[in-house]
């Protein structure tokens, strides 16, 4: 026997109190699939959240963060304060990266500079709070008669996948 509720489309709910007829979702609620026995309450983007997509009867609202904050968690469940490059967010707010570490983004933590000597290379460009060191050729490669230096490949910005 077919469930009469299975005929209720998205944007409606199957009303137990009215002989299982399909009733439209009330304001501020939605059902994204058919056959639902309740509409769900729309997410509200308040405070540091702002509305990226309004709620409709068939889909939930989507939030992002106001300027100065960035999304964290599935579906932007949290907004975290941005810091400047060269800083990281701590419980006490944005703090400069310690010497020997860097952060080239407005989010995330300070990471140690690359240790060039581990790869047998020399430091070509010193690191800063905002940038990692650039490792050059190994000291042996710099001896007279060695082939010319090829510049290092640019580092890909972490946290971004290729387009």
């Amino acid at each position: 026997l077919q469930d009469p509720c299975s005929n209720c489309p998205a944007g409606t709910f199957c009303d137990n109190n009215r002989n299982q007829i399909c009733s439209p979702c009330p304001p501020n609620s939605f059902s994204s699939a058919g056959g639902q026995r309740t509409c769900d309450i729309c997410r509200q983007c308040k405070g540091v959240f702002r509305t990226r997509k309004e709620c409709s009867s068939t889909s939930n609202a989507e939030c992002d963060c106001t300027p100065g904050f960035h999304c964290l968690g599935a579906g932007c469940s949290m907004c975290e304060q941005d810091c400047k490059q060269g800083q990281e967010l701590t419980k006490k707010g944005c703090k400069d990266c310690c010497f020997g570490t860097f952060n080239d983004q407005k989010r995330g933590i300070c990471r140690p500079w690359t240790n060039c000597s581990l790869d047998g290379k020399s430091v070509l460009v010193n690191g800063t709070k905002e940038r990692d060191v650039v490792c050059g050729p190994s000291p042996a490669d710099l001896s007279p008669g060695a082939s010319s230096v090829t510049p290092p490949a640019p580092a890909r910005e972490p946290g971004h996948s290729p387009q």
Epitope: C25, T38, C39
Partner: antibody, heavy 121, light 106 residues
Framework: QVQLVQSGAEVKKPGASVKMSCKAS????????MHWLKQAPGQGLEWIGY????????NYNQKFTDRATLTADKSTSTAYMELSSLRSEDTAVYYC??????????????WGQGTTVTVSS | EIVLTQSPDFQSATPKEKVTITCRAS?????IHWYQQKPGSSPKAWIS???NLASGVPSRFSGSGSGTSYTLTINRVEAEDAATYYC?????????FGQGTKLEIK
């Protein structure tokens, strides 16, 4: 008859987490939404959030978004709430309450007996 | 969020007296629900959608109102009505409750 039976009292230290349960019986668990509410000693009622056991969809009071996690197990008709990073202000009775979403009125028609959580060092 | 303010906070009444509890919303709401809570017990569903009495609620109770002003009325109050009464809305997220009105029967 329709019943919501909640887990027993808990005593926790600040910074700890607590997970409480709410077992439903006497009705079809997935036809109703399950809400969680807080009542601090001598205070009024505060809505924490709800879960739709049918879909797993959750909606939270923004005040509790980062510390409360609601889940539901359809196989045992049980809803759970985990509260993390506990502090003294979390000392309260926590209720689960059923709402007939199909009435579209969001009215809590059946309540659990409450779980008392005490946060103390 | 919508703030619900109940008045009075505390009411003392004698049996057979008429009691009125008011719930005012900071902005317009579609309907109000009422709950009764006795000390040491869970709240109980009392009146839904402004005026529908929950199962088992005596007919001396009634509810009315619209927009920003709602009332719960007890026509001839009885000793068993001593409790705290809460109003609740969901016209806007989050669900909110009034602070409660404690009713004492002398």
């Amino acid at each position: 008859q329709v019943q919501l039976v909640q887990s027993g009292a808990e005593v926790k230290k600040p910074g700890a987490s607590v997970k409480m349960s709410c077992k439903a019986s006497g009705y079809t668990f997935t036809f109703y939404t399950m809400h969680w509410l807080k009542q601090a000693p001598g205070q009024g009622l505060e809505w924490i959030g709800y879960i739709n056991p049918s879909s797993g969809y959750t909606n939270y009071n923004q005040k509790f978004t980062d510390r409360a996690t609601l889940t539901a197990d359809k196989s045992t008709s049980t809803a759970y709430m985990e509260l993390s990073s506990l502090r003294s202000e979390d000392t309260a009775v926590y209720y689960c309450a059923r709402s007939d979403g199909s009435s579209s009125k969001w009215y809590f028609d059946v309540w659990g007996q409450g779980t008392t959580v005490t946060v103390s060092s | 969020e919508i703030v619900l303010t109940q008045s009075p906070d505390f009411q003392s009444a004698t049996p057979k007296e008429k009691v009125t509890i008011t719930c005012r919303a900071s902005s317009s709401v579609s309907y109000i629900h009422w709950y009764q809570q006795k000390p040491g017990s869970s709240p109980k569903a009392w009146i839904s959608a402004t005026s529908n009495l929950a199962s088992g609620v005596p007919s001396r109770f009634s509810g009315s109102g619209s927009g920003t002003s709602y009332t719960l009325t007890i026509n001839r109050v009885e000793a068993e009505d001593a409790a705290t009464y809460y109003c609740q809305q969901w016209s806007s997220n989050p669900f909110t409750f009034g602070q409660g009105t404690k009713l004492e029967i002398k």
